[in-house]
């Protein structure tokens, strides 16, 4: 049977063996990946990148979220949606997770100039059907996947709106398990409005294989801020394994190649 | 009452290798990351590396990325460093340090340690 | 890195005068910024956090501002035990970086 894939920290953690970044398959190998380093500088100003319209997101729910052996994942079941944004048609919610590490400065997976971040947390959304603007594009589109990305670095300040997710880690150490989350909503995890207005977009891929190329990246400037307890929560409470012998921690795929792509920031 | 108990000074030989201590009291020491910081004599000080003493993850400064090892030992809140291929660069005194918060001040010190690397 | 610099590199003061240390960051760091006292012999004292932000047991006449690249670590008035070389440091982003530090003497 095929190697499961994995990232470095599991292989050199573990018996089992697992395809680590450089060995991932499916079109991992393709030259219009993520993540990738975001030179501030070079990013164009695009006039289209306006604001982001969130549907849904204010909304109080009791979330579902699950161990999945690779991060810590919320099941968002259409329950919200998002437009505007310089983005071509509305996206539905899909699930949320995060990357991290047990230090700061190495959790994230998007850097910016050169700089990573304690966390980074991805909303993943798919396109709404019938959307799409030509038959090329149906077909083939580069821009199925909306994910917007959030790099988290550390405050002073417990943030209140990540406490449901945080608490409810203790429930989900080992993959496959799953637990509802105490009743919040997704604009509680977000950064207020007006820090929303500026980021970076991208086209390239899900960072996790099969690494499928038809992902619109936005990444915003500003940071959420978490306290350093629930940032080492993350690593401290979850596990890769069912034994609980390798705890949950650099889930992060290396940079990739940014080549012949731009960048362009709102 | 938080404190950092470091090991005593050493005199060693060029090439050698050592390990210096921190002992570490009044805290929960696995919720707190462990810093070393150099300092050579009249100079100011340089940040070598981080553990998180809970996880056993190590961070260094790309300086000291083949010259220092970073450990801790959870049983008996202590943290290590180990220097290896002693040169004279490497007398100075070395500290470890609490970080306060997340990737942010140091805000408890260990007295320092003195290392004289001689022949 | 983030390349932090300090002025003066010696501060003369007579006691009871006010002193001001100066810290200029290469890039703008918010108020990720601490200060620290460290006597001759003696390790690191935290005597600021977060630029202006005042530490429990330091005493009050010590105070802190600025933010982006500019900080100012002040005495109101300075006694003999003040004494000692004053360093900043950023970690506003990795690797977190000091400043040659000022040496505060007495005229």
């Known amino acids: 049977a095929e190697s499961h894939w994995c990232y470095e920290v599991q292989a050199e953690s573990s018996n089992y063996p697992c395809l680590v970044p450089v060995k991932w398959g499916g079109n991992c190998q393709k030259d219009r990946q993520s993540p990738i380093n975001i030179v501030t500088t070079k990013a164009k100003v695009d006039k289209k990148l306006g604001r982001f319209f969130f549907s849904g997101y204010d909304k109080k729910q009791t979330w579902t979220v699950q161990n999945n052996g690779h991060s810590v994942m919320m099941l968002l079941e259409n329950k919200a949606s998002i437009s505007g944004g310089g983005l071509p048609a509305p996206y539905q919610a899909k699930q949320l997770h995060l990357h991290w590490s047990d230090l700061p400065y190495k959790g994230s997976e998007h850097s910016l100039d050169g700089e990573h971040f304690a966390m980074e947390m991805h909303i993943v959304h798919e396109k709404e059907k019938g959307t799409s603007r030509n038959v090329k594009e149906a077909q083939d589109p580069e821009d199925e996947i909306a994910v917007l990305a959030f790099l988290v670095e550390a405050g002073t300040q417990v943030n209140e709106g990540f406490q449901p997710l945080v608490e409810a880690l203790s429930n989900i150490p080992k993959p496959e398990m799953s637990t509802t989350m105490a009743e919040s909503s997704l604009l509680d995890l977000l950064p207020k409005e007006e820090k929303l207005r500026h980021y970076f977009r991208y086209l390239g891929s899900l960072t996790t294989p099969t690494c499928d190329e038809k992902v619109v990246w936005t990444v915003f400037r500003e940071p959420i801020q978490l306290h350093r307890e629930q940032i080492l929560a993350f690593s401290q409470k979850l596990y890769y394994d069912k034994e609980q012998t390798v705890s949950m921690k650099d889930n992060v795929r290396p940079l990739q190649q940014l080549g012949q792509r731009t960048v362009i920031k709102s | 009452d938080v404190q950092l108990v470091e090991s005593g000074a050493e005199l060693v030989r060029p090439g050698t290798s050592m390990k210096m201590s921190c002992k570490a009291s009044g805290y929960a020491f696995t919720n707190y990351l462990i810093e070393w910081i150099k300092q050579r004599p009249g100079q100011g000080l340089e940040w070598i590396g981080v553990i998180n003493p809970g996880s056993g993850g190590t961070h260094y400064n790309e300086k000291f990325k083949d010259k220092a090892t970073l450990t801790a030992d959870k049983s008996s809140s202590t943290a290590y460093m180990q220097l290896s291929s002693l040169t004279s660069d490497d007398s100075a005194v070395y500290f470890c340090?609490?970080?306060?918060?997340?990737?942010?001040?140091?805000?408890?010190w260990g007295q320092g340690t003195t290392l004289t690397v001689s022949s | 890195q983030i390349q932090i610099t300090q002025s003066p590199a010696i501060l003369s003061v007579s006691p009871g005068e006010r002193v001001s240390f100066s810290c200029r960051a290469s890039q703008s760091i918010g108020t990720r910024i601490h200060w620290y006292q460290q006597r001759t012999n003696g390790s690191p004292r935290l005597l600021i956090k977060?630029?202006?932000e005042s530490i429990s047991g330091i005493p009050s006449r010590f105070s802190g501002s600025g933010s982006g690249t500019d900080f100012t670590l002040s005495i109101n008035s300075v006694e003999s035990e003040d004494i000692a070389v004053y360093y900043c440091?950023?970690?506003?982003?990795?690797?977190?970086?000091f400043g040659a530090g000022t040496k505060l003497e007495l005229k």
């Open positions: 440091q950023q970690s506003n982003s990795w690797p977190t970086t």
């Open positions: 340090a609490r970080e306060g918060d997340y990737a942010s001040r140091f805000d408890y």
């Open positions: 977060y630029a202006s």
